[in-house]
């Protein structure tokens, strides 16, 4: 599941990793755009082994994965994109 959240909270990520995570290990991805209390874009990945990690948005592998997921969600519906505004 790919999620895009717009929140007024401060930054969530206190550290970021560039280490590649294979798609088969990923359960959910959340994208927090910059602004609204956090000056940078944040990407949070939940893994199937019940761990959670912030991924460096500049990491090439996550950029490629995001592009694949975006294309897939715009053509079909297996990976829905949720947009939620939180006041």
């Amino acid at each position: 599941v790919l999620e895009v959240y717009y929140t007024s909270l401060r930054c969530r990520c206190v550290q970021e990793s560039s280490v590649f995570i294979p798609r088969r290990f990923i359960d959910r991805i959340q994208i927090l755009p910059r602004g609204n209390g956090c000056p940078r874009k944040e990407i949070i990945v939940w893994k199937k082994n019940k761990s959670i990690v912030c991924v460096d948005p500049q990491a090439e592998w996550i950029q490629r994965m995001m592009e694949v997921l975006r294309k897939r969600s715009s053509s079909t519906l297996p990976v829905p994109v949720f947009k939620r505004k939180i006041p």
């Epitope: 990520c13 206190v14 959910r28 949070i44 939940w46 082994n49 019940k50 761990s51 959670i52 912030c54």
Partner: antibody
Framework: QVTLKESGPEILQPSQTLSLTCTFS??????????VGWIRQPSGKGLEWLAN???????YYNPSLINRLTISKDTSNNQAFLKITNVDTTDSATYYC??????????????WGQGVMVTVSS | DIQMTQSPSSMSASLGDRVTITCQAS??????LIWFQQKPGKSPRPLIY???NLANGVPSRFSGRRSESNYSLTISSLESEDMADYHC?????????FGAGTKLELK
């Protein structure tokens, strides 16, 4: 306000099964990312993680005790359970129920119960 | 399993002292380490998360550092309310493992 409370026998005999209940409030085990676990602490000693159960019924156990542990949950009644079979005196400890939530920043065991003291004695 | 070697097991210090407790991880855990404080007769509570970040409501005299596989908790100026047990926890991988704990007493 998040609270957790453990209950179970104060004393039991070697070879018996220890059954513990955690009753919690202020959160639910149904939302994505929520988990409850058990940690124990023998008197005057360190902490030992025992098991976790997650919203989707995924379970994780300490390998050193995996054959004796069973963790389960009753989501609708806000309860989690731990069973330890074939106890002996080394299982005497204070048992804590703990909450974990997979959010960022991730702080596992962010809330603890008051603990229940269990003594195994013949 | 990842072993967490915590030292000292106990120590006594005077009010106003600078106190440091350390944990060493047997494998790479990155910053996936938490320090807990446990006051006598009470349950532990998170003090520092991701090795260096202060949890909500924790006084600024507490700080955490990481140097490779060595992690330290420092109290810059000891106060009486800091008398407690301190535990480190690695959550890099299951099974999550704690250090043996440090009992901090008043000299």
């Amino acid at each position: 306000q998040v609270t957790l409370k453990e209950s179970g026998p104060e004393i039991l005999q070697p070879s018996q099964t220890l059954s513990l209940t955690c009753t919690f409030s202020g959160f639910s085990l149904s939302p994505y990312g929520m988990g409850v676990g058990w940690i124990r602490q023998p008197s005057g000693k360190g902490l030992e993680w025992l098991a976790n159960i997650w919203w989707d019924d995924d379970k994780y156990y300490n390998p050193s005790l995996i054959n004796r542990l069973t963790i389960s949950k009753d989501t609708s009644n806000n309860q989690a359970f731990l069973k330890i079979t074939n106890v002996d005196t080394t299982d005497s400890a204070t048992y804590y129920c703990v909450r974990s939530e997979l959010v960022m920043p991730y702080v596992p065991f962010d809330y603890w119960g008051q603990g229940v003291m269990v003594t195994v004695s013949s | 399993d990842i072993q967490m070697t915590q030292s000292p097991s106990s120590m006594s210090a005077s009010l106003g002292d600078r106190v440091t407790i350390t944990c060493q991880a047997s494998q790479d855990i990155g910053n996936d380490l938490i320090w807990f404080q446990q006051k006598p007769g009470k349950s532990p509570r998170p003090l520092i998360y991701y090795a260096t970040n202060l949890a909500n409501g924790v006084p600024s005299r507490f700080s955490g550092r990481r140097s490779e596989s060595n992690y330290s908790l420092t109290i810059s100026s000891l106060e009486s309310e800091d008398m407690a047990d301190y535990h480190c926890l690695q959550f890099k991988q299951y099974p999550y493992t704690f250090g043996a704990g440090t009992k901090l007493e008043l000299k």
